[in-house]
């Protein structure tokens, strides 16, 4: 008997310091390049080894980035979102949404799965 798959959504503020090759993650998404169906949000596609995000440890592949330094990322073209990150300065505050897959088994077993949805 298969359990139902649910998602636990949490938000977190992450402060990163820019390294020699940026903040240490790649993004996908935007109004012109939807990564998730019917969602033009900006998502983390890759965390770079030894980059700022990896060293901090909180940002995960599949996370949705809601804002950069308080600036909302809703309804942005992909390149406009990229430019926000490029020009965000040395100390960068990210508001991110983690989406954890939770398996509700027949006896209530809960296990975390792939957050990338």
């Amino acid at each position: 008997m298969n359990g139902r798959v649910d998602y636990l959504v949490t938000e977190e503020e992450i402060n990163l310091t820019r390294g020699p090759s940026g903040l240490g993650f790649n993004i996908v998404g935007g109004t012109d390049q939807q990564y998730v169906s019917n969602d033009s949000g900006i998502y983390v596609s890759r965390i770079k080894e030894n980059g700022a995000a990896a060293l901090d440890g909180r940002l995960q592949e599949g996370d949705k980035i809601l804002s950069v330094n308080g600036q909302d990322l809703k309804n942005l073209l992909h390149q406009d979102a990229v430019d926000l990150f490029r020009n965000a300065g040395y100390a960068v505050s990210l508001r991110v949404q983690h989406r954890l897959q939770v398996q509700n088994g027949p006896i209530g077993h809960r296990g975390e799965g792939d957050p990338s949805g």
């Epitope: 090759s21 940026g22 790649n26 996908v28 992909h78």
Partner: nanobody, 126 residues
Framework: DVQLVESGGGLVQPGGSLRLSCAAS????????IGWFRQAPGKEREGVSC???????YYADSVKGRFTISRDNVKNTLYLQMNSLKPEDTALYYC????????????????????WGQGTQVTVSE
């Protein structure tokens, strides 16, 4: 320090082939969306071919079926195999990477990339 160094350009006859290389140092190539760009004298720079960190590829219409982009993660090197070369392929060829975008089409169409090589000249002529 992040560095990209191109090589492999030269003079070739129409119909000939070349393989360009772009050696990366200071970062791991497969963590980045990266691509090949070219600029001919008096013309705007154009994206030729780009590849995302996950391996998705984009080719400009003018090179589809003739050029192939690839990456050797062990050698930390990007390649561009150029076949059936035409005089209009004559240009200075650069590789460039984006620190943020992982969308190969956007990278190839971008004016705002973060790391550039110095370029290697390709001349296609009799």
């Amino acid at each position: 320090d992040v560095q990209l160094v191109e090589s492999g350009g030269g003079l070739v006859q129409p119909g000939g082939s070349l393989r360009l290389s772009c050696a990366a140092s200071g970062f791991t190539l497969d963590d980045y969306a990266i691509g090949w760009f070219r600029q001919a004298p008096g013309k705007e720079r154009e994206g030729v071919s780009c590849i995302s960190s996950h391996g998705s590829t984009y080719y400009a219409d003018s090179v589809k079926g003739r050029f192939t982009i690839s990456r050797d993660n062990v050698k930390n090197t990007l390649y561009l195999q150029m076949n059936s070369l035409k005089p209009e392929d004559t240009a200075l060829y650069y590789c460039a990477a984006s620190y943020y975008s992982d969308y190969e089409v956007a990278v190839c169409r971008s004016d705002a990339l973060d790391a550039w090589g110095q370029g290697t000249q390709v001349t296609v002529s009799e």
